[in-house]
Interface confidence: medium
Amino acid sequence: HNTTVFQGVEGQSLQVSCPYDSMKHWGRRKAWCRQLGEKGPCQRVVSTHNLWLLSFLRRRNGSTAITDDTLGGTLTITLRNLQPHDAGFYQCQSLHGSEADTLRKVLVEVLADPLDHRDAGDLWVPGESESFEDAHVEHSISRSLLEGEIPFPPTS
């Protein structure tokens, strides 16, 4: 699996999408987990409804919510009020019994440009790259890690 990077602005919401083959994963619940180190376990953060037919219902754990479009084959995770400690490696998983298949490996990056938190004024000129009304809308960028990029930096 390649790692897909999702970037969100600190304090705003970030939506992570994990597409999958709806037929292959028919009847399976899904989960969102946080990777603990390169070789470590993936710690469950939140999972979809216990009844697969109700997977479309949003389930929440703290500031993280999950919902599954089982027909369209898209798992969506929303991280609200994104904070620097949310940055890190995650996985979207498809559950079957005690096993879990990885649907997508995700790197969440929290962007923290200080100008995003300034009132309109001296430096911040609305209209320069966006309108002031747009400033708090949910935005995200996703991209795949380039070949050769190291997803986990080597530990010293």
């Epitope: 970037q7 602005v9 962007l111 923290a112 009132d119 001296d122 995200s140």
Partner: antibody, heavy 115, light 112 residues
């Protein structure tokens, strides 16, 4: 006129503590996220710590090199921000600036850690 | 961490001539909404850093328009079209996209 005035810097021995104060005026302090940035002699600036506003629950962040030793705090009623520095090391020797990391910077206060 | 490198580390310029300083980032500084979080500062001798350019190419308040910033996701340039005496000091690039915020090593500008 915007002013940030840092005080509290001095010569201390390794392992000791020091508390820096930054008194500000001339801008809406309570809304502004504030930082401490330090600069060792002949070196580039290094970001140290950051504190958000009340509306963000005064969330704090630290550079790895000071995590667990330094504590940033603020008093909105006094328009002041503080840096409590414990277990000081010789490599903490630097001029410490209080700043919004954009336009507003203090003149700095010198912290020297030496035996 | 995001590492910034600058070139040259020192620069000697005749007043009236142009000067160019390069800054390279180990990671892309292009964030959401196509905003590039690269900042330039000038630190005059014995003074605090002062902001020159924010978000790669925007001139900070009160900064003369002989200063300009440009670049891409990882490679950035600060240009001074006609260097003046008051431009002497150390120029730093800085990234404020990810914690920890980081600064470049600095480029010392002096006059010939």
């Amino acid at each position: 006129e915007v002013q940030l005035v840092e005080t509290g810097g001095s010569l201390v021995q390794p392992g000791k503590s020091l508390r820096l104060t930054c008194a500000t005026s001339g801008f809406p302090f309570s809304n502004v996220w504030l930082h401490w940035v330090r600069q060792s002699p002949e070196k580039h600036p290094e970001w140290v710590a950051h504190i958000k506003a009340k509306s963000d629950n005064y969330a704090t962040y630290y550079a790895e090199s000071v995590k667990g030793r330094f504590t940033i705090s603020r008093d909105d009623s006094k328009s002041s921000v503080f840096l409590q520095m414990n277990s000081l090391k010789e490599e903490d020797t630097a001029i410490y600036y209080c700043t919004d990391i954009l336009e507003y910077w203090g003149q700095g206060t010198l912290v020297t850690v030496s035996s | 961490d995001t590492v910034l490198t600058q070139a040259p580390l020192s620069l000697s310029v005749t007043p009236g001539e142009s000067a160019s300083i390069s800054c390279r980032s180990s990671k892309s500084l292009l964030g959401v909404r196509d905003i590039t979080s690269l900042y330039w500062y000038l630190q005059k001798p014995g003074k605090s850093p002062q902001l020159l350019i924010y978000r790669m190419s925007n001139l900070a308040s009160g900064v003369p328009d002989r200063f300009s910033g440009s670049g891409s996701e990882t490679d950035f340039t600060l240009k001074i079209s006609e260097v003046e005496t008051e431009d002497v000091g150390v120029y730093y690039c800085a990234q404020f996209l990810r914690y920890p915020y980081t600064f470049g090593p600095g480029t010392k500008l002096e006059l010939k």
